[in-house]
């Protein structure tokens, strides 16, 4: 039986241009993490495996950098970035887990709506 | 002016499905997620999902994941809602919404499209 | 998925009255920024809902200023200061920062 929950960063507004970290945390369960997946729809992000660590996505390799933990931080974000993304656990003996993050990248004159845009 | 004109009401056969639009005028499509919200009862609100016209990106409820298919056509500033096999259960006003940018609200919706499961 | 509690689910009011509706969420809806995501909906009958305040307490354009909004963490409130014949009809808020997205079950502001 599966009775792990996963906790994430939260739903995240950012500006174009700046950096954000996607953070998932896996709790309430004594499984083992054997990987984690990040993907944007039906892309491959990065893989962070507990035997043989981390591995970013060629196309992604110059903007997602590994971390902190098992998060992924995006940088020189762009509007096309916008969208969800998942952390996908996959545990032993429960199985997978999955958390969602959707990422809304906005071009930097929305600022006049008083939004608090995260640049780390 | 922000406007969101949806089609008008629906009665569809058990097990049929059928598609709902929602045309967009008085602000840059591409530039707002648009939102799918069903009402049932006359009352509850529950939140369907979400398309990002600029990448195609969309986000979905699980609970209509298979249920619902978003889509949108930029050309014509629409965005549509697919329902599949629909049954008595899925009666009910759906309303589509621009999202508010950087606070994931709604803030301008369409009048509501009514649909109607029925035999 | 995080659930909405509003309460109460009734209220019942005469115009000139002030009142607060309370909603509460089974997780902290402020995010790793500091942003928390919860707006609050009028739907009066035969209408659209409309939005009243995004981002806790931030009233949307033309939204009279009777209204406000307070909270954090899990704990919101929307006030109305002075309640007139326009303001009936179905409260609800809304949390955005977890996915999918969830309303609370309504609270009806109807006259006494």
């Known amino acids: 039986m599966m009775t792990g929950t996963i906790e994430t960063t939260g739903n995240i507004s950012a500006e174009k241009g700046g950096s954000i970290i996607l953070q998932c945390h896996l709790s309430s369960t004594t499984a083992q993490v054997t990987q984690v997946n990040w993907e944007q729809q039906d892309q491959l992000l990065a893989i962070c495996n507990a035997d043989l660590g981390w591995h970013i996505s060629p196309s992604f390799k110059d903007r997602v950098a590994p971390g902190p933990g098992l998060g992924l931080t995006l940088q020189s974000l762009t509007v096309n970035d916008t969208g969800e993304y998942f952390c996908i656990y996959h545990t032993y003996p429960d199985g997978t887990y999955t958390g969602r993050i959707f990422l809304e990248v906005l071009e930097s004159s929305v600022a006049e709506h008083g939004a608090r845009f995260q640049i780390p | 002016e922000v406007q969101l004109q949806q089609s008008g009401p629906e009665l569809v056969r058990p097990g049929g499905s059928m598609k709902i639009s929602c045309k967009a005028s008085?602000?840059?499509?591409?530039?707002?997620?648009m939102n799918w919200v069903k009402q049932s009862h006359g009352q509850n609100l529950e939140w369907i999902g979400l398309?990002?016209?600029?990448?195609?990106?969309?986000s979905y409820n699980q609970k209509f994941q298979g249920k619902a298919t978003l889509t949108v056509d930029k050309s014509s500033s629409t965005a549509y809602m697919e329902l599949l096999s629909l049954t008595s259960e899925d009666s009910a006003v759906f309303y589509c919404?621009?999202?508010?940018?950087?606070?994931?609200?709604?803030?301008?919706w369409g009048q509501g499209t009514s649909v109607t499961v029925s035999s | 998925d995080v659930v909405m509690t509003q309460t109460p689910l009734s209220l019942p009011v005469s115009f000139g009255d002030q009142v607060s509706i309370s909603c509460r969420s089974s997780q902290n809806l402020t995010n790793s920024y500091g942003n928390t995501y919860l707006s609050w909906y009028l739907h009066k009958p035969g209408q659209s809902p409309q939005l009243l305040i995004y981002g806790i307490s931030n009233r949307f354009s033309g939204v009279p200023d009777r209204f406000s909004g307070s909270g954090s963490g899990t704990d919101f409130t929307l006030k109305i200061s002075t309640i007139k014949p326009e303001d009936l009809g179905m409260y609800y808020c809304l949390q955005g920062t977890h996915q999918p997205w969830t309303f609370g079950g309504g609270t009806k502001l109807e006259i006494k």
């Open positions: 008085g602000y840059s499509f591409t530039g707002y997620t």
């Open positions: 919404a621009r999202g508010l940018r950087g606070y994931f609200a709604m803030d301008y």
């Open positions: 398309i990002i016209p600029y990448n195609g990106g969309s």
